[in-house]
């Protein structure tokens, strides 16, 4: 058993059919020694009388709020939360497994640029009596300060007779250095409680595999005179770092026609402008990378032909 | 929302057998692990057993164990209580119920409840 937050403890219960289960014992918070009687949740039913109760946790059924009482004054109070193992395997049942890039991915987190910030995000389908709680590291056995703000419901959405809530948190590595050779990996930590289940999911990563650019910004065309050709032109992203002749993004540029069947012209460049052909409704779209490191791509940026 | 709805309950003679189902609308079920409770007349309302989300593990009240087997089709959206040996003192109406909690025989870690079945063992 450990203390999770102040009065909110979690028991360890590596649970099968018929397993004794783990004993605990809890003490009432008072100097007081004699008249002290203890109940669960908002039932009446006296467990046990004396300054500490030894209970066997078995299952959830044993989980709840404890309180201690002395001619009906509230003493103290310990919640008693579960982190259930079976088969060896701690369980996973509040986050859903995103399986990208790979399965048992419940956390994914991504960086628009090197400055230290990023953002995890993970999905659920429970929807009340939830609760989560997020730390992080740069490094584990002589961590690094990293400063994550609030978990919050960011979006929700309808998945067949689902709904799926996804949350998301913001982090920043208190001193980062933007221009550094990564030689430990970030930490994420998320405690989560639903109900009176505890579980808890990590995900460790160097910022440069999560970086993610933002899409291109004011992405132009200029027809060139007496041609079917176009310059197109865009710029660095805001969010990406600087200076640019530094952190060197490249990039992709695709001319697609109305009809997805139709045949893709794409251009790869390191510039801000390149000279495609402009067919009739096609459209033009640029997306970004890192050049000397390949992580991901950018959502694409685009304009209409016409 | 879940709605749950239980069938299968009958008159049987002690030492007989008989399967309840659950069949569960609304939200997605897979999600809910699934319990099984029964209230005799004059009594509280009794844990007989539970199955987790995907099916893989199952937990009894020591009453039942060994006679009833319960097992969960995600594809019907159904939970099943096979009873079997019944005797006398299993007459009861026979609650499914879903939860997010998995072990548990407390009734309040559910949060969805059907109407139940009535279930009578004669001798």
């Known amino acids: 058993i450990w203390e999770l937050k102040k009065d909110v403890y979690v028991v360890e219960l590596d649970w099968y059919p018929d397993a004794p289960g783990e004993m605990v014992v809890l003490t009432c918070d008072t100097p007081e020694e004699d008249g002290i009687t203890w109940t669960l949740d908002q039932s009446s039913e006296v467990l046990g009388s004396g300054k500490t109760l030894t209970i066997q946790v078995k299952e959830f059924g044993d989980a709840g709020q404890y309180t201690c009482h002395k001619g009906g004054e509230v003493l103290s109070h310990s919640l008693l939360l579960l982190h259930k193992k079976e088969d060896g395997i701690w369980s996973t049942d509040i986050l859903k497994d995103q399986k990208e890039p790979k399965n048992k991915t419940f956390l994914r987190c991504e960086a628009k640029n090197y400055s230290g910030r990023f953002t995890c995000w993970w999905l659920t389908t429970i929807s009340t009596d939830l609760t989560f709680s997020v730390k992080s590291s740069r490094g584990s056995s002589d961590p690094q300060g990293v400063t994550c703000g609030a978990a919050t419901l960011s979006a929700e959405r309808v998945r067949g007779d689902n709904k799926e809530y996804e949350y998301s948190v913001e982090c920043q590595e208190d001193s980062a250095c933007p221009a550094a050779e990564e030689s430990l990996p970030i930490e994420v930590m998320v405690d989560a409680v639903h109900k009176l289940k505890y579980e808890n999911y990590t995900s460790s990563f160097f910022i440069r595999d999560i970086i993610k650019p933002d899409p291109p910004k004011n992405l132009q065309l200029k027809p060139l005179k007496n041609s079917r050709q176009v310059e197109v032109s865009w710029e660095y992203p805001d969010t990406w770092s600087t200076p640019h002749s530094y952190f060197s993004l490249t990039f992709c540029v695709q001319v697609q026609g109305k009809s997805k069947r139709e045949k893709k012209d794409r251009v790869f460049t390191d510039k801000t402008s390149a000279t495609v052909i402009c067919r009739k409704n096609a459209s033009i779209s640029v997306r970004a990378q890192d050049r000397y490191y390949s992580s991901s791509w950018s959502e694409w940026a685009s304009v209409p032909c016409s | 929302e879940v709605q749950l709805v239980e069938s299968g309950g009958g008159v049987v003679q002690a030492g007989e057998s008989l399967r309840l189902s659950c069949a569960a609308s609304?939200?997605?079920?897979?999600?809910?692990?699934m319990g099984w409770f029964r209230q005799a007349p004059g009594t509280e309302r009794e844990f007989v057993g539970s199955?987790?989300?995907?099916?893989?593990?199952?937990y009894y009240a020591d009453s039942v164990k060994g006679r009833f087997t319960i097992s969960r089709d995600n594809a019907k959206n159904t939970v099943y209580l096979q009873m079997s040996g019944l005797k006398p003192d299993d007459t009861a109406v026979y609650y499914c119920a879903a939860g997010w909690l998995y072990p548990s025989s407390r009734s309040r870690d559910y949060d969805y409840w059907g109407q139940g079945t009535q279930v009578t063992v004669s001798s």
């Open positions: 609304g939200r997605s079920f897979s999600n809910y692990e």
């Open positions: 199955i987790n989300l995907r099916g893989s593990s199952t």
